[in-house]
């Protein structure tokens, strides 16, 4: 039996800059029941607070609701482990909510087969930013990727589209069914999950209306 091992805060994420969660790895428990607490202070303040919500985001986590989240302040976060033999603390982690945003995937993914005047066919992929992000005001600057592949293929073909919410894909095989997904990344944050797949069949005949 021994004091608990050092815990580690291994991830913090925010879907929208309005709430965030931090998760920790407990470390060894020293063979004894061990209690974990997350404490934090904010830049320029001496007061230390305890995690406002240990439940919402599951085990070994702390959820900061809107009421507790500010993008103006750096959070200095520590996890403490305590058992009958002693205690240990993680290294303090400095968290700027601006830098932990992992948004929801883009939505309204639509696929349209189009044809140019020279009869060349292409796939026009369009989507909308995630619901919660206020992209129009510049509060979020979002970059996007799309990926597509024939239904039976292993490898995805990825296209970075920058800030565009539409993209034209040329040179696709007639008669093939293609799967398409999109994802987004805010200027300082992390890529979202890939959106749900949409599919489209490229026509065999090229007599399409534009």
């Amino acid at each position: 039996q021994s004091p608990p091992g050092k815990p580690e805060i291994h991830k913090c994420r925010s879907p929208d800059k309005e709430t965030f969660t931090c998760w920790w790895n407990p470390g060894t428990d020293g063979g004894l029941p061990t209690n974990y607490s997350l404490t934090y202070s904010k830049e320029g303040e001496k007061t230390t607070y305890e995690c406002p919500d240990y439940k919402t985001s599951g085990p070994n986590s702390c959820f900061f609701s809107k009421q507790y989240t500010s993008i103006w302040k750096i959070y200095i976060i520590t996890v403490n482990a305590t058992n009958q033999m002693g205690s240990s603390s993680s290294d303090p982690l400095y968290v700027d909510v601006t830098y932990i945003v992992e948004p929801e995937p883009p939505r309204n993914l639509t696929l349209e087969v189009k044809q140019l005047k020279d009869k060349k066919t292409y796939l026009w992929v369009k989507w909308s930013p995630p619901t919660i992000t206020d992209v129009k005001t510049g509060w979020f600057t979002m970059e996007y990727e799309i990926r597509l592949k024939p239904e039976e293929a292993e490898e995805w073909e990825i296209h970075f589209t920058g800030h565009q919410t539409q993209f034209k894909v040329f040179d696709l095989y007639p008669g093939q069914k293609y799967l398409v997904q999109t994802r987004c990344k805010p200027d300082h944050g992390y890529w979202s999950r890939w959106s749900q797949e949409s599919s489209v069949e490229m026509p065999n005949d090229f007599t399409l209306k534009d």
């Epitope: 968290v95 700027d96 601006t98 300082h188 890529w191």
Partner: antibody
Framework: EVQLVQSGAEVKKPGSSVKVSCKAS????????MHWVRQAPGQGLEWIGV????????NYNQKFKGRATLTVDESSSTAYMELSSLRSEDTAVYYC???????????WGQGTLVTVSS | DVVMTQTPLSLSVTPGQPASISCRSS???????????LHWYLQKPGQSPQLLIY???NRFSGVPDRFSGSGSGTDFTLKISRVEAEDVGVYFC?????????FGGGTKVEIK
């Protein structure tokens, strides 16, 4: 304890490439972005770029785009910075540096001196 | 790129006396989120740089309170209220509001 341990000094010829490694320990490697910064002899610091080890997303200083390549090996918790088409002005100490979830550098490697000389 | 200009280039200070380093940026350093990402690092002889001050005026963990930062917009200052022997080295200001992140040329602090 967070540690970033870099590979040893290198002497390279102009026009060649160098690959510097940075082995991370004491934290979850994929959870934090890894930056690279260099310092020419007696000079200031220059940011080269950053990589997200969780999905290898990179962002480069335009000055180094096309010449610097940042990669990671998740299995060994190691980050790499390769610089090609070396010239004498690339003689510098190269540092890997980790932030927290912030945009400054909390932890630094010990530095790797790269000397470019014919 | 944002150019960071530090003055003076070097400083020789008597122990116990104050010291002040100025840093001027070629563009305003207020981020779109309202924060000002101006930081100060100290590089002691033969060592890697270490963070002293983040976001203009916040002392990093373990940094003595004799170090303080101030400023706004394009003009920033690092002050050491009473210089000690262990404070020798090169001080760098750095901005991370605009990509690429950039650093000042450094100010070398020596003890008289």
């Amino acid at each position: 304890e967070v540690q970033l341990v870099q590979s040893g000094a290198e002497v390279k010829k102009p026009g060649s490439s160098v690959k510097v490694s940075c082995k991370a320990s004491g934290y979850t490697f994929t959870s934090f972005w890894m930056h690279w910064v260099r310092q020419a002899p007696g000079q200031g610091l220059e940011w080269i770029g950053v990589i997200d080890p969780s999905d290898t997303y990179t962002n480069y200083n335009q000055k180094f785009k096309g010449r610097a390549t940042l990669t990671v090996d998740e299995s060994s918790s190691t980050a790499y910075m390769e610089l090609s088409s070396l010239r004498s002005e690339d003689t510098a100490v190269y540092y890997c540096a980790r932030g927290d979830y912030s945009n400054w550098f909390t932890y630094w490697g010990q530095g790797t001196l790269v000397t470019v000389s014919s | 790129d944002v150019v960071m200009t530090q003055t003076p280039l070097s400083l020789s200070v008597t122990p116990g006396q104050p010291a002040s380093i100025s840093c001027r940026s070629s563009q305003r350093l207020v981020h779109s989120n309202g924060n000002t990402y101006l930081h100060w690092y100290l590089q002691k002889p033969g060592q890697s740089p270490q963070l002293l001050i983040y976001k203009v005026s916040n002392r990093f963990s373990g940094v003595p309170d004799r170090f303080s930062g101030s400023g706004s917009g394009t003009d920033f200052t690092l002050k050491i209220s009473r210089v000690e022997a262990e404070d020798v080295g090169v001080y760098f200001c750095s901005q991370s509001t605009h990509v690429p992140w950039t650093f000042g040329g450094g100010t070398k602090v020596e003890i008289k």
